[in-house]
Interface confidence: low
Amino acid sequence: QLTTESMPFNVAEGKEVLLLVHNLPQQLFGYSWYKGERVDGNRQIVGYAIGTQQATPGPANSGRETIYPNASLLIQNVTQNDTGFYTLQVIKSDLVNEEATGQFHVYPELPKPSISSNNSNPVEDKDAVAFTCEPETQDTTYLWWINNQSLPVSPRLQLSNGNRTLTLLSVTRNDTGPYECEIQNPVSANRSDPVTLNVTYGPDTPTISPSDTYYRPGANLSLSCYAASNPPAQYSWLINGTFQQSTQELFIPNITVNNSGSYTCHANNSVTGCNRTTVKTIIVTELSPVVAKPQIKASKTTVTGDKDSVNLTCSTNDTGISIRWFFKNQSLPSSERMKLSQGNTTLSINPVKREDAGTYWCEVFNPISKNQSDPIMLNVNYNALPQENGLSPG
């Protein structure tokens, strides 16, 4: 049975399509191609005479068609008007005609899309935003990407208008994007430039740094305040309830005990109209007890690697202090083999390894003073490995 096949079935505008013919009969006079689903002389594209190998254009010929000796028809530089059915008529030597109909679909090369938005400066937890992918075109699939990934499943994301519109319900600060839309048809795809949202939010509860509470008289007090906010928050400071200044940082040189009190940071976002405050207590004290130098002791100072364990103890007579340990200027513990116990007074290493050899010391401190022990040296030896088979290595 005579059949035709389109290569490809879906064609991009401006490209070419080949109408292939299968099972062409023997003993032929010739054949003709027609636009449409039936033989119609007014819609003949081309005829071909086998004997003369002559192709004759018909009324529907556009000059873009080429017929081949095997009856296949090539149409170049196709337009959307070329979409549809094509009929091949084969004239056999017995003058009995045979027909076959094929079809193809021409799609446009899609333009680069763009994203329009109904609100590019939404307020967190308050506004919704609708993105629309332009232009609207027929036979087109619309896809959306957030942060270069396809849309996550979320009750806050809604697609509508044939997926052309993406709505974010109740935006959050994490919804800044970028957002891209992609349009696709069977022959082409194109993605928009990225669009970002300027989500207005905050301020969150501010944090005051550093975290220190105790200061000595004569020191400089330098406090900094930060609250996550868009646009950035405006800051002001109050001491014991009295307004001081509208800056993010507060600096008081050469403090005295009179500077003790409640320090309040006030953060304000003029767009959201929200305010947040944080209060910090600062204590300036004359009392400056010198923390005594702690003593460090080891259960043994020379150990066998991968076999022995060792306990280091930090001793002090002071009260209300904290203890921390150091090894080669690094804070401990630094591995799972090291454990602190008894309020950090004891450091246990089990088992000891070669890399544990070196200098250890402890430090005792309170809010306004600290002191450290003399160092202690830990030596790690390894026994010679026994010979497995009596052979010397080499």
């Epitope: 096949e5 290569m7 490809p8 490209k15 292939l20 099972n23 170049q76």
Partner: antibody, heavy 120, light 113 residues
Framework: EVQLLESGGGLVQPGGSLRLSCAAS????????LYWVRQAPGKGLEWVAT????????SYADSVKGRFTISRDNSKNTLYLQMNSLRAEDTAMYYC?????????????WGQGTLVTVSS | DIVMTQSPDSLAVSLGERATINCKSS????????????LAWYQQKPGQPPKLLIY???TRESGVPDRFSGSGSGTDFTLTISSLQAEDVAVYYC?????????FGGGTKVEIK
């Protein structure tokens, strides 16, 4: 007699570019679909790209999409493969091939190949 | 994309014995327009380009000895060498030729036992 002769292979650094050519003779060049196929040393055959009779339709293997471009000059009876952003894994013998008949079909005729080596 | 899977990877057969190579496609290669299976088989000897043996799954290319035959339909195909000759030692590849996907199988090396 159908003949396909590839050229343009050689040594190139990763990230570099190379343009392969395939000169055809012995048949009506503009009537046939053409292909590039490659074979890494000691590995199997991998179809790389296809081009239609007029050059209006092209298709590529995922491994080269966006980096390689197939084209043809029917007036010169020559097929081309422009290879950009080359990687070590592009090292292979590159063959051009011709379809059996007018449409896209099995690869009836092959060239002898040209070797591309991507190495620093 | 269509994935073509060949088995076995290698095959050792005595001279004069039958060799059978299988090829499985991840989707049907049967073209409803002409009821033909769009599968080809190629033979490649060391240092040479591949040579077409069979197309449309079972149609032998002109000049190919009749000891080579192809069979199968849809997704499962077989190349059979009915009586292996010394000159048949080569790697054999199956290939989908459904436009625009021309994926090859991984190849089967045929040797003499």
């Amino acid at each position: 007699e159908v003949q396909l002769l590839e050229s343009g292979g050689g040594l190139v650094q990763p990230g570099g570019s190379l343009r392969l050519s395939c000169a055809a003779s012995g048949f009506s060049f503009s009537d046939y679909y053409l292909y590039w196929v490659r074979q890494a040393p000691g590995k199997g055959l991998e179809w790389v790209a296809t081009i239609s009779v007029g050059g209006g339709q092209t298709s590529y293997a995922d491994s080269v999409k966006g980096r390689f471009t197939i084209s043809r000059d029917n007036s010169k009876n020559t097929l081309y493969l422009q290879m950009n952003s080359l990687r070590a894994e592009d090292t292979a013998m590159y063959y051009c091939a011709r379809a059996m008949y007018y449409g896209p079909a099995w690869f009836a005729y092959w060239g002898q190949g040209t070797l591309v080596t991507v190495s620093s | 994309d269509i994935v073509m899977t060949q088995s076995p990877d290698s095959l050792a057969v005595s001279l004069g014995e039958r060799a059978t190579i299988n090829c499985k496609s991840s989707q049907s290669l049967l073209n409803s327009a002409n009821q033909k299976n769009y599968l080809a088989w190629y033979q490649q000897k060391p240092g040479q380009p591949p040579k077409l043996l069979i197309y449309f799954a079972s149609t032998r290319e002109s000049g190919v000895p009749d000891r080579f035959s192809g069979s199968g339909s849809g997704t499962d195909f077989t190349l059979t060498i009915s009586s292996l000759q010394a000159e048949d030692v080569a790697v054999y590849y199956c290939q989908s030729h459904i436009y625009p996907n021309f994926t090859f199988g991984g190849g089967t090396k045929v040797e003499i036992k």
